[in-house]
Amino acid sequence: MKVLQEPTCVSDYMSISTCEWKMNGPTNCSTELRLLYQLVFLLSEAHTCIPENNGGAGCVCHLLMDDVVSADNYTLDLWAGQQLLWKGSFKPSEHVKPRAPGNLTVHTNVSDTLLLTWSNPYPPDNYLYNHLTYAVNIWSENDPADFRIYNVTYLEPSLRIAASTLKSGISYRARVRAWAQCYNTTWSEWSPSTKWHNSYREPFEQH
């Protein structure tokens, strides 16, 4: 049994880091493998993660962590029984994938303005809480070409757009994702999408 693709890990910078790897053949990850992880920290204890299958030869492990600070560094040992298959380390602050925003809502009753709001996925005491920026994706269910991205570079989790920038009388969907420049993170997953029917009063034309 050998590791074909070494573990790569990403952290949500809160409580979970996710490590994925591939073996050289079909593997029952949960029965054959264990990923041991330990904070490089005087008198810390090692913890064991039981991996799950992620495709035939792929494995994934969700490492539970006590918060995350920038100095954190973990040692990782991948074991198959008594055999050490791989040894490495992981610094969560250097591999951050933020949690996805939630509770995306479209408010359509504000004088021909669409107000999109969502929730910051972090509690106020987490470092990322004040460092997230967002991308909002809006698309038409009827017209695949009608697909747009709005970059929200301020901290407030909301976006206002004129309803008239979208076509009237058709349904749209929106979703939002987050990233943090301070840690050069990857983008989060997209939030679940929300749907609304776009309608607005055409401006009265004067001749």
Partner: antibody, heavy 120, light 108 residues
Framework: EVQLLESGGGLVQPGGSLRLSCAAS????????MHWVRQAPGKGLEYVSG????????YYANSVKGRFTISRDNPKNTLFLQMSSLRAEDTAVYYC?????????????WGQGTTVTVSS | EIVLTQSPGTLSLSPGERATLSCRAS???????LAWYQQKPGQAPRLLIY???RRATGIPDRFSGSGSGTDFTLTISRLEPEDFAVYYC?????????FGQGTKLEIK
């Protein structure tokens, strides 16, 4: 209420021994690494020794290595420090301290301290 | 072994003023953690800041920590009468624990 209560301090002659105890209440000792920190009269804080939550690993400052032994009895929620070959410079208030991993070494609960005096 | 040096040794200020306490490490700190403690006469120390900048439970927001590498700072934005005490920085690393020698904050 989370509390640590040290006992076992006293007056001892140079070369003698003492065993300090620390009783924990209000939390489960087995979830935490535990440490001893001391403070000589009118001086600053000095780290002495620590033990991992399971008791499987220990650490000692160079000044006490080979003379002091830290141990724990998790079912009894008690921490110990066995001190031998005591010297005058070991005279101090000894604090039992809890370290929360989430606090990254921050010692969030301290006992009131027990005084050890080494003198002839 | 890393040595922590605190400065100044004594700081004399008045209530309402801003206090800035320094802690310098003899070598750079990457995978290690800095904490700050307050100690009043006859009492055990109290944890103020951990992980360089995070306030411990129940600590007022006038206390803040910052820094990286070798230089770390504890700032008390507006001194209250109860803040006059001795302050210690502490390094908790992979292989050792070290305290600074302390800074005494006294009323001017």
């Amino acid at each position: 209420e989370v509390q640590l209560l040290e006992s076992g301090g006293g007056l001892v002659q140079p070369g003698g021994s003492l065993r300090l105890s620390c009783a924990a209440s209000g939390f489960t000792l087995s979830s935490y690494a535990m440490h001893w920190v001391r403070q000589a009269p009118g001086k600053g804080l000095e780290y002495v020794s620590g033990i991992s939550s399971s008791g499987s690993s220990t650490y000692y400052a160079n000044s006490v290595k080979g003379r002091f032994t830290i141990s724990r009895d998790n079912p009894k929620n008690t921490l110990f420090l066995q001190m031998s070959s005591l010297r005058a410079e070991d005279t101090a208030v000894y604090y039992c301290v809890r370290v929360k991993v989430a606090y990254r070494g921050g010692m969030d609960v301290w006992g009131q301290g027990t005084t050890v005096t080494v003198s002839s | 072994e890393i040595v922590l040096t605190q400065s100044p040794g004594t700081l004399s200020l008045s209530p309402g003023e801003r206090a800035t306490l320094s802690c310098r490490a003899s070598q750079g700190i990457s995978s290690a953690y800095l904490a700050w403690y307050q100690q009043k006469p006859g009492q055990a120390p109290r944890l103020l800041i951990y992980g360089t900048s995070r306030r411990a439970t129940g600590i007022p927001d006038r206390f803040s920590g910052s820094g990286s590498g070798t230089d770390f700072t504890l700032t008390i934005s507006r001194l209250e009468p109860e803040d006059f005490a001795v302050y210690y920085c502490q390094l908790y690393g992979a292989t050792s624990v070290t305290f600074g020698q302390g800074t005494k904050l006294e009323i001017k």
